[in-house]
């Protein structure tokens, strides 16, 4: 049969609220060298126990009896500390355990999860969470909105999760946890009601350097919208936007619109350029979320200036004209040049030169027409830019370079058909 247990004092019981500090103690009397005392909780050796061991000899000789006291300190009682505690010693080839002591937790409910502050769009459903535990169990929850209970009694309404179908004003929520020991109240969460995301962002009109856009505002609860903010960003390098990144790859152009109307003219844009735009609207509570980026493009414009450095020289029945691209912005893709020449008493001749910047003209007759002048204009798909001032044809002087070009015969009668959006020049010779 087993030897008698050396334990003369066993751990007591501790029951208290979270945070309590307490000590468990066991005492044994042994003969010879005192053993190390280990502590068990629910059968598991406590490897990092905050324990102290005191040994007192009862006689002069080492082989006499010793009193050994081990104390286990529980510094701040938590649920994980609860269970059955025993002391364990190894004496010779035998193992001894003390009678058990019990550590229990009992107090006001303890929150594992509390409602968090958040922002929600007006009239949009959302959930809040609250979770509490004892012991003692059960723990019943009662939700409050703006300090008003949402159920007749604890445990009767929603418990861990509160579903709110939507709010039209900023509100506060908290939950009460009730158990046999009393009531604990959670933190109060503020739910801020922001405007809904605007809808239907679209283009109203386009100009080469400006876009007019409009949108439909979302609901904003009891808080009127104060303004809307529109952002535009060049999308040449806007790969991030296409990939749905939340922020543009470069500093956006930001404009504010008073509302109503929910419309804004965005100026100072580059012509014939792709942009991405988005809008958010703000109330006294804060801004809505941004709309998705909308790809838009400014249309082409006509060149803003005439071709430069026009030179026109005449040699008998031929005239050589050359020029350079306009210095002013083209506002689009240059499609070519138009040239007009006119004598003092002859009708004006209009020609489409294409993208060449020089032309040799075959003049009618013997070249005796007097006071010949030439004008040149650049054009894009949007139409003609301004015509240059008339340049008189100077007589060719020997020594001047005269490049050889394919001759352009003057038609017997100028018959040009212009698209309706191309405007005719109105220069006077």
């Amino acid at each position: 049969q087993a030897e008698e247990s050396p334990f003369v004092g066993n751990p007591g019981n501790i029951t208290g609220a979270r945070g309590l500090t307490g000590t468990l103690r066991c005492q044994l009397q042994v003969q010879g060298e005192p053993p190390e005392v280990h502590w068990l909780r629910d059968g598991q050796i406590l490897e990092l126990a905050d324990s102290t061991q005191t040994q007192v000899p009862l006689g002069e000789d080492e082989q006499d009896d010793w009193i050994v006291v081990s104390q286990l300190r529980i510094t701040s009682l938590q649920l994980s500390d609860t269970g059955q505690y025993q002391c364990l010693v190894f004496l010779g080839h035998q193992t001894f355990v003390s009678q058990p002591g019990y550590v229990g937790l009992e107090g006001l409910p303890y929150f594992l999860e509390e409602p968090e502050d958040r922002t929600v769009a007006a009239n949009t459903p959302f959930n809040l969470s609250c979770q509490a535990q004892g012991p003692p169990e059960p723990v019943d929850l009662l939700w409050l909105q703006d300090a008003v209970p949402l159920a007749t009694a604890p445990g009767h309404g929603p418990q861990r999760s509160l579903h709110v179908p939507g709010l039209n004003k900023t509100s506060s929520f908290s939950c009460e946890a009730h158990n046999a020991k009393g009531v604990t109240t959670s933190r109060t969460a503020t739910i801020t009601v922001l405007p809904q995301q605007p809808r239907n962002l679209h283009l109203v009109s386009r100009q080469p350097t400006e876009l007019e856009v409009a949108w439909t505002p979302g609901l904003s609860g009891i808080y009127p919208l104060t303004h809307c903010t529109l952002q535009a960003v060049l999308s040449d390098d806007g790969m991030g936007i296409q990939a749905g990144e939340p922020d543009p790859p470069e500093e956006p152009l930001t404009s504010q619109a008073s509302v109503p109307p929910h419309q804004l003219r965005l100026g100072s844009l580059h012509p014939h350029t792709p942009y991405h735009i988005r809008v958010a609207c703000t109330s006294s509570q804060g801004p809505s979320s941004w709309t998705h980026w909308l790809p838009v493009e400014t249309p082409e414009g006509v060149p803003l200036g005439p071709p430069e450095n026009i030179s026109a020289t005449r040699n008998g029945s031929q005239a050589f004209v050359h020029w350079q691209e306009p210095r002013a912005p083209l506002q689009g893709t240059l499609l070519g040049y138009r040239l007009a020449y006119q004598g003092q008493d002859t009708p004006e001749v209009l020609m489409d030169i294409g993208l060449r910047q020089e032309v040799t003209l075959e003049l009618q007759g013997d070249g005796s027409v007097s006071n010949l002048t030439v004008c040149v204009a650049a054009y894009t798909a949007a139409g003609d830019g301004p015509w240059s001032l008339p340049v008189p044809l100077e007589a060719w002087r020997p020594g001047q370079a005269q490049p050889v070009h394919q001759l352009v015969k003057e038609p017997s009668t100028p018959a040009f058909s212009w698209p309706h959006h191309h405007h005719h020049h109105h220069h006077h010779h």
């Epitope: 049969q1 059968g43 598991q44 050796i45 025993q86």
Partner: antibody
Framework: QVQLVQSGAEVKKPGASVKVSCKAS????????INWVRQAPGQGLEWMGW????????KYNEKFKGRVTMTRDTSISTAYMELSRLRSDDTAVYYC?????????WGQGTLVTVSS | EIVLTQSPATLSLSPGERATLSCSAS?????MYWYQQKPGQAPRLLIY???NLASGIPARFSGSGSGTDFTLTISSLEPEDFAVYYC?????????FGQGTKLEIK
């Protein structure tokens, strides 16, 4: 000396239950935890849970919760392990073992075969 | 749960040789325990609290290690030592065992 003696081998059909006993002697039965550990053929060891005979408190491995029940009869120093809804993969040797933070004494094992 | 990995899976040695068995834990633990199991028998405790020899176990068995790496050493193998050896932890629940190292005669 400490001894743990288990009941004999069992053959069960899938869906049935089995109850294995473990009789302790040579030490104060109510002071030490009795654990149950199983070993499938050619496999390693798997802890199933414990019972503290002094109070009847139990702790089960999550894997077996809902299927295992551990009880004891202190008057005859015997612990029991019942496993229900048996499946073919429950075929194993079931050991009881005394524990003091580890398993210092073991029963001889009980072979439970689950076969249709 | 803490996973214990034993190496090697099989160790082939001759009587009189020194055997070194390793056990690695997936996270740090305080104590390791070692068991010996022979065919048709229950496991038997060899080492407790990492380095303490259990009752009736010959002194040629020793245990060491800390943190995640632990070792069982048999200084000079006897014929009766050829068996399967398991390491075990109970630093966290549930207690778990290694998959075993089979020590066989070369």
């Amino acid at each position: 000396q400490v001894q743990l003696v288990q009941s004999g081998a069992e053959v069960k059909k899938p869906g049935a239950s089995v109850k294995v006993s473990c009789k302790a002697s040579g030490y104060p039965f109510t002071d030490f935890y009795i654990n149950w550990v199983r070993q499938a053929p050619g496999q390693g060891l798997e802890w199933m849970g414990w019972i503290y005979p002094g109070s009847g408190n139990t702790k089960y491995n999550e894997k077996f919760k809902g299927r295992v029940t551990m009880t004891r009869d202190t008057s005859i120093s015997t612990a029991y392990m019942e496993l229900s809804r048996l499946r073919s993969d429950d075929t194993a040797v079931y050991y009881c073992a005394r524990s003091t933070g580890f398993f210092d004494y073991w029963g001889q094992g009980t072979l439970v075969t689950v076969s249709s | 749960e803490i996973v214990l990995t034993q190496s090697p899976a099989t160790l082939s040695l001759s009587p009189g040789e020194r055997a070194t068995l390793s056990c690695s834990a997936s996270s740090s633990i305080g104590y390791m325990y070692w068991y010996q199991q022979k065919p048709g028998q229950a496991p038997r405790l060899l080492i407790y609290l990492t380095s303490n020899l259990a009752s009736g176990i010959p002194a040629r068995f020793s245990g060491s290690g800390s943190g995640t790496d632990f070792t069982l050493t048999i200084s000079s193998l006897e014929p009766e030592d050829f068996a399967v050896y398991y390491c075990q932890q109970w630093s966290s629940n549930p207690p778990t065992f290694g998959q075993g190292t089979k020590l066989e005669i070369k």
